[in-house]
């Protein structure tokens, strides 16, 4: 298996809100769990948006998950990734 590279980015959404996006790329096989946690527990699915798991042209795959959060609350959120029995968590970068 090829482990994913995970990258978390932030972008301005509307006043007082930001969109945080967690991207996983260059992984194989294609089965992956990518989700946001808030305060250490799962963030409800209806507040998250997932991209399709797509081939990236190198025999590996990429995908993403995003959610909108209040500016200043970034520290409450982490992106959780699990792939082929390995997992990691990734914080939101500071502004």
């Amino acid at each position: 298996s090829v482990p994913p590279m995970v990258n978390v980015t932030r972008s301005e959404a509307s006043e007082g809100n930001i969109t945080v996006t967690c991207r996983a790329s260059s992984f194989y096989p294609r089965n992956i769990t990518l989700t946001w946690r808030q305060d250490g527990v799962s963030l409800s699915h209806d507040t998250q948006q997932w991209g399709d798991v797509l081939p990236d042209g190198n025999g590996t795959y990429q995908t993403w998950v995003a959610t909108r959060i209040c500016q200043g609350e970034e520290q409450r959120f982490t992106c959780y990734m699990e792939h082929s029995g390995n997992h990691s968590t990734h914080p939101v970068p500071s502004g």
Partner: antibody
Framework: DVQLQGSGPGLVKPSQSLSLTCSVT???????YYWNWIRQFPGNKLEWM?????????NYNPSLKNRISITRDTSKNQFFLKLSSVTTEDTATYYC???DGRGAWFAYWAQGTLVTVSA | DIQMTQSPASLSASVGETVTITCRAS??????LAWYQQKQGKSPQLLVY???TLADGVPSRFSGSGSGTQYSLKINSLQPEDFGNYYC?????????FGAGTKVEIK
């Protein structure tokens, strides 16, 4: 390394309020993490009661919501549990514990404080 | 609320044996599960989180597994210091809840 130490009276009368203190050393409670109270009843059942976060927000177990308050004193690096209108059913060993935002598992626990509710 | 059902309630095993404790959640908790060991008069100690990851300093004879609603903690080659109570805890959602515990006694 971070250390948590719980303290408070070991005996409380029914209908009164139970108040406990958790003193934290080695880490500022306003920097990060979630600062929790958990209790263990006679017979060993564990119950998560609630937390105060690094930012000061609370989350409580709904089974206790109208009786519980978790507050903090940032200048003393302490957080507190207040449980009102106690009954003998609140007799338990009370623990303060910490988890971080990666996941709500408890890596750091204080030694327990046994609280008996009795007339 | 998600309820956690642990089994067995107690077990007795000899040093060197392998024991397995199971925990069933009332809903899918997607590997959001931790295991703790507690010895008499002491605080619980974290053994496993995210269903499979050993906490720092935990011996490799402990292992976690499972998915969905069914999870297990296995202790290979049971040692005398492994006696005590074991608890599972989910962190899928609030409120966080624990299993009722499994008491492990050494024969």
């Amino acid at each position: 390394d971070v250390q948590l130490q719980g303290s408070g009276p070991g005996l409380v009368k029914p209908s009164q309020s139970l108040s406990l203190t958790c003193s934290v050393t080695g880490y500022s409670i306003t920097n990060d993490y979630y600062w929790n109270w958990i209790r263990q009843f006679p017979g060993n059942k564990l119950e998560w009661m609630g937390f105060i976060s690094f930012g000061g927000s609370n989350n409580y177990n709904p089974s206790l919501k109208n009786r519980i308050s978790i507050t903090r004193d940032t200048s003393k690096n302490q957080f507190f549990l207040k449980l009102s209108s106690v009954t003998t059913e609140d007799t338990a060993t009370y623990y303060c514990a910490r988890y971080d935002g990666r996941g709500a598992w408890f890596a750091y626990w204080a030694q327990g404080t046994l609280v008996t509710v009795s007339a | 609320d998600i309820q956690m059902t642990q089994s067995p309630a107690s077990l007795s095993a000899s040093v060197g044996e392998t024991v397995t404790i199971t925990c069933r959640a009332s809903g899918n908790i997607h590997n959001y599960l931790a295991w703790y060991q507690q010895k008499q008069g002491k605080s619980p100690q974290l053994l496993v989180y995210d269903a499979i990851t050993l906490a720092d300093g935990v011996p490799s004879r402990f292992s976690g597994s499972g998915s969905g609603t069914q999870y297990s903690l296995k202790i290979n080659s049971l040692q005398p210091e492994d006696f005590g109570n074991y608890y599972c805890q989910h962190f899928w959602s609030f409120p966080l809840t624990f299993g009722a515990g499994t008491k492990v006694e050494i024969k």
